[in-house]
Interface confidence: low
């Protein structure tokens, strides 16, 4: 029997080859575009991760961009000291020196000037004197009892530098700024021959179930958790401790029908703050059933288990957990490198290329 093909057969083979080639190219193209969804409770570090992507993969912030953050640095600094002063009233903590009461009044009078991106020597002096006060420091040490920006001490300890008239915020200063995210922030960058689209939906405050399906088919979800939230005192308008709120949210995302094919990457963030806190505040504040030691390693591992145990598809779905410090560029760079390798591996699997 002959092996020769008819013209029709040849055409069919060519057509089949072309379809295979197109499928492979489409698969490779799809494998090259990575959609990342950043999720997590408020102030868990999502926006800081976005800023790190700009620093690591997009040459960082230009001098002009840094200058624009000056007003935010000043606002964060002033809001931090004001938050402490107001908490002193609520917690009934006195100033170490009576004269500080006048500085506190002056602070409220002068605070407005910093909104124009100027910190007058008078205002800087008032903040410095207040920050050095024993009562203020006592109140700062009790910040778990009220809401205080994580970067409060970063800026307040560096007042001499940031209050200079020629001050230009550094990349680290920019990373430390806190601006409430509104809406959905989209960031694009290229890394390891992949085109990343990162979506920070932290500012999307409306009911999650109404919009979450729009992100069906995202390559991966990076879920941020602030480890240091474990000991925060429940605010009157909160139903549950921030850590438990975070676990509830993670449960709903991890086991969501829209994300059955999505890699779930868990960033247990603010590990630096957690490492300091765990020396003073026992983990039983958050997890009364915890019987382990209050060492960083054991306590962090326990929290990791608490989150990973929420995964109801353990046989088919793996949670990729990393301990992070979102303000540490080297740490984020290292972790994101590992995350990208997981994404590449999983993507190639899905496209039949692995």
């Amino acid at each position: 029997m002959g092996c020769t093909l008819s013209a029709e057969d040849k055409a069919a083979v060519e057509r089949s080859k072309m379809i295979d080639r197109n499928l492979r190219e489409d698969g490779e193209k799809a494998a090259k575009e990575v959609k990342l969804l950043l999720l997590g409770a408020g102030e868990s570090g999502k926006s800081t991760i976005v800023k790190q992507m700009k620093i690591i993969h997009e040459d960082g912030y230009s001098e002009d961009e840094c200058k624009q953050y000056k007003v935010v640095v000043y606002s964060n600094t002033i809001q931090s000291i004001i938050a402490i002063i107001r908490a002193m009233g609520r917690l009934k903590i006195d100033f170490g020196e009576a004269a500080r009461a006048d500085d506190a009044r002056q602070l409220f009078v002068l605070a407005g000037s910093a909104e124009e991106g100027v910190m007058t020597p008078e205002l800087a002096g008032v903040i410095k004197r207040l920050w050095r006060d024993g009562g203020v420091q006592a109140c700062f040490s009790r910040s778990r009892e009220y809401q205080l920006n994580d970067s409060a001490s970063y800026y307040l300890n560096d007042l001499d530098r940031i209050s200079q008239s020629n001050y230009i915020p550094t990349q680290q200063d920019v990373l430390r700024t806190r601006v409430k995210t509104t809406g959905i922030v989209e960031t694009h960058f290229t890394f390891k021959d992949l085109y990343f689209k990162m979506f920070d939906v932290g500012g999307q405050r409306s009911e999650r179930k109404k919009w979450i399906h729009c992100f069906e088919g995202v390559t991966a979800i990076i879920f941020c958790v602030a480890l240091s939230d474990y000991d925060l005192v429940l605010a009157e308008d909160e139903e549950m401790n921030r850590m438990h709120e975070s676990m509830k949210l993670f449960d709903s995302i991890c086991n969501n029908k829209w994300f059955t094919e999505t890699s779930i990457i868990l960033f247990l963030n603010k590990k630096d703050l957690f490492e300091e806190k765990i020396k003073r505040s026992p983990l039983t504040i958050c997890y009364p059933e915890y019987t382990g030691s209050n060492t960083y390693e054991e306590a962090a591992a326990y929290i990791q288990c608490q989150f990973e145990d929420l995964n109801r598809r353990k046989d088919t779905k793996e949670i990729y957990t990393h301990f992070t410090c979102a303000t540490d560029t080297k740490n984020v760079q290292f972790v994101f490198d590992a995350v990208t390798d997981v994404i590449i591996k999983n993507n190639l699997k899905e496209c039949g290329l692995y």
Epitope: A87, R90, L91, K92, D94, Y146, E236
Partner: antibody
Framework: EVQLLESGGGLVQPGGSLRLSCAAS????????MYWVRQAPGKGLEWVSS????????YYADSVKGRFTISRDNSKNTLYLQMNSLRAEDTAVYYC??????????????WGQGTLVTVSS | DIQMTQSPSSLSASVGDRVTITCRAS??????LNWYQQKPGKAPKLLIY???SLQSGVPSRFSGSGSGTDFTLTISSLQPEDFATYYC?????????FGQGTKLEIK
């Protein structure tokens, strides 16, 4: 039982002075924030002044600043309000009250019965 | 200073009625709001602190709710001893400020 007992009110001419006292008992006075609140006849409540525990930081309403002085004597468990340069608009019942903090929230949980100050010529 | 506005200024109701008094702050005060009751010739008495926490010894027919700028004091079933003037007070910012009062009268 917590008790706050004001005294020292009375009739005084405009420009005159009065010193109000508030004797406290039934709680640890020295560690309590204390308030003076007043109420003009037929009107609402108005915060006048407060004094912290410990270092005794003092705070005043703009309407009395420079004329009134709040002070305390922890050894006598007594709160004072020295009122100088009195005006007709200072006419009111003056209450002393204890400010308590619970879970970061402050509120006035105990009040004295009040003492009437009348400024009139 | 933060302005506290109560409404209504006065209202008439009958024993057994459900009554609601509202208090609005000129800016957000989170839940740093207290409610007081005052009867003629008497000192004010604390009813509710932190917007919704019932002070010890206060009957459970009194309840408070709200956060941010809008707050409510509710009396579920008026009793004869509840006819008085009610004041809200914010404790978030210095100076502490009171609402102008709501006088609750017998219909």
């Amino acid at each position: 039982e917590v008790q706050l007992l004001e005294s020292g009110g009375g009739l005084v001419q405009p420009g005159g002075s009065l010193r109000l006292s508030c004797a406290a008992s039934g709680f640890t006075f020295s560690s309590s924030y204390m308030y003076w609140v007043r109420q003009a006849p037929g009107k609402g409540l108005e915060w006048v002044s407060s004094i912290s525990s410990g270092y005794s930081s003092t705070y005043y309403a703009d309407s009395v600043k420079g004329r009134f002085t709040i002070s305390r004597d922890n050894s006598k468990n007594t709160l004072y309000l020295q009122m100088n340069s009195l005006r007709a608009e200072d006419t009111a019942v003056y209450y002393c009250a204890r400010d308590v903090s619970h879970g970061g929230h402050s509120f006035l949980d105990y009040w004295g019965q009040g003492t009437l100050v009348t400024v009139s010529s | 200073d933060i302005q506290m506005t109560q409404s209504p200024s006065s209202l008439s109701a009958s024993v057994g009625d459900r009554v609601t008094i509202t208090c609005r702050a000129s800016q957000s005060i989170s839940s740093y709001l207290n409610w007081y009751q005052q009867k003629p010739g008497k000192a004010p008495k604390l009813l509710i602190y932190a917007a919704s926490s019932l002070q010890s010894g206060v009957p459970s027919r009194f309840s408070g709710s709200g956060s941010g700028t809008d707050f409510t004091l509710t009396i579920s079933s008026l009793q004869p001893e509840d006819f008085a003037t009610y004041y809200c007070q914010q404790a978030d910012y210095y100076p502490p400020t009171f609402g102008q009062g709501t006088k609750l009268e017998i219909k």
